[in-house]
């Protein structure tokens, strides 16, 4: 912790200026008034304080605002944001997208994923929902950050906003997040024609149920293997060999490359070897001919 000393009269600070660069940590602690610092936060980022000095300034703000900083201070944190922990950020109430932009810019190139995720979460809470302006800001200033939001937060996205989301914004989304986003995307793109619909819905398909994947297989979409590999395991397992062949079209040959990887491996184990052989890809591991498949899960559910 910072040692407490009294401020020498000649070092008293009346404004936040560049001379503070040459204040030792104990002098900053003793001589900088926290209220003055908060009022002149906009000056701090123009001064190349070291990380040690920023620690002292953060300590001052923490003492002044134990319940969390006001947005007027947050907006001007600049490089001081790099000193914030997710726990600090959880105390904030942020509604301004200008504040979000400023802090996203500062965090670029630094290992700040947890802090950024918490910040975005606070913005969504502060604004009440994940509106189009927020999504536009995230896609412009922090590609991939949309996926840092919890499924609960993503559930506040109105379907009308889904169109602003680009494929690369969903690259890091997990299954639970896509489960939330997919129905919204389906609703948002429902009036589009077959091929246009597929292009739009493709990045969200990691959240699609079996019946929707089956429906796509009837539309000659020629799904690429990368998209197929991102489908939910539960959505792929019930598909027949014929359905997968129709779904992938010319890309079906890629199954051989992926036969050891989920969900392809799991799907192969559920198919009759005879059916797999019709693909002519040499896929192995299907159910041998003459074997009876018992679905024990049904019996377990009844007992």
């Amino acid at each position: 912790d910072v040692e407490r000393t009294t401020c020498p009269p000649e070092k008293e600070v009346h404004e936040i200026d560049e001379s503070l660069i040459f204040y030792k940590k104990r002098e900053l602690e003793a001589c900088v008034d926290a209220a003055l610092l908060a009022a002149q936060m906009d000056r701090v980022d123009a001064i190349p304080f070291t990380y040690e000095q920023l620690d002292v300034l953060k300590h001052k703000l923490d003492e002044l605002y134990p319940q969390g900083y006001p947005e007027s201070v947050i907006r001007h944190l600049g490089h001081l944001f790099l000193k914030m922990s997710p726990e600090d950020i959880r105390k904030w109430n942020v509604t301004s997208l200008e504040t979000l932009k400023a802090l996203l810019k500062v965090s670029k190139g630094h290992e700040m994923s947890a802090q950024v995720a918490t910040l975005i979460d606070r913005v969504v809470v502060g604004r009440g929902q994940l509106d189009k302006d927020t999504v536009d800001t995230l896609t412009a200033f922090c590609p991939g950050c949309l996926c840092s939001l919890s499924p609960e937060r993503l559930s506040s996205v109105p379907p009308s906003v889904i169109g602003a989301v680009r494929p690369q914004d969903l690259d890091t989304c997990g299954p639970r997040q896509l489960d939330v986003l997919y129905p919204k995307a389906r609703l948002a793109f429902q009036n589009m024609s077959g091929s246009e619909y597929f292009v739009k819905i493709r990045p969200f398909l990691g959240g699609a149920p079996t019946e929707d994947v089956k429906a796509l297989s009837q539309q000659n979409v020629s799904m690429d293997l990368a998209t197929f590999m991102k489908l939910r395991r539960e959505a792929v397992l019930p598909l027949t060999v014929a359905e997968v062949q129709k779904l992938l079209g010319p890309h079906v040959e890629g199954l051989k490359v992926e036969e050891q990887h989920s969900p392809v491996r799991d799907w192969i184990l559920k198919q009759r070897q005879d059916d797999l052989d019709t693909l002519g890809l040499g896929l192995q591991g299907g159910i041998p001919n003459g074997y009876l498949i018992l679905d024990l899960s049904v019996r377990e559910a009844l007992s």
């Epitope: 001379s19 030792k24 190349p48 990380y51 000095q53």
Partner: antibody, heavy 118, light 107 residues
Framework: QVQLQQSGAELVRPGTSVKVSCKAS????????IEWVKQRPGQGLEWIGV????????KYNEKFKGKATLTADKSSSTAYMQLSSLTSEDSAVYFC???????????WGQGTLVTVSA | DIVMTQSHKFMSTSVGDRVSITCKAS??????VAWYQRKPGQSPKLLIY???TRHTGVPDRFTGSGSGTDYTLTISYMQAEDLALYYC?????????FGGGTKLEIK
Amino acid sequence: QVQLQQSGAELVRPGTSVKVSCKASGYAFTNYLIEWVKQRPGQGLEWIGVINPGSGGTKYNEKFKGKATLTADKSSSTAYMQLSSLTSEDSAVYFCASDYDYDPFAYWGQGTLVTVSA
Amino acid sequence: DIVMTQSHKFMSTSVGDRVSITCKASQDVSTAVAWYQRKPGQSPKLLIYWASTRHTGVPDRFTGSGSGTDYTLTISYMQAEDLALYYCQQHYSTPYTFGGGTKLEIK
């Protein structure tokens, strides 16, 4: 003890660029700022700019914006100053100095003589 | 930019003398003034900062004083090894600026 070791003298052609290095030892490089200063023969000292090796943040004298570019490599504890579009006016000794323990220009490198000549 | 003026380019002195070198800032620099010593063929060395704080290892015959715009470096008892060029500098705001220097010579 704190030491700043600068690269050797350079003879360069007008219009080209040169990169001067300043290797710090004896302290935590990222904890303190590195300043750069110019001294032309028979003239005074001129502050060029400062870099925060921890964050990479820089601040320049307006006079040297576009002329000098300051960088730092944390892994080798070395600060660099690149001077571009060199003219005879850039012929000078260039010093780096560390604001060690927050004391201004507390320790200086030995200086690097840059001579711009056709 | 803040201009730092050292009115004496040269000062004659003898060993044992008390010597005062002055420096004037073009505006109030709130005691953010440093003094450096430079000997021929060497880099500058920090002597004093914040107008009166002696840097580590600097002999106590060197003292600094002043406030506002007027600052002084005093050598209480001149030694032969103190013959050098002395610069003042303001570290109050960028661009940091130096005085033109005062050279101490033997009478």
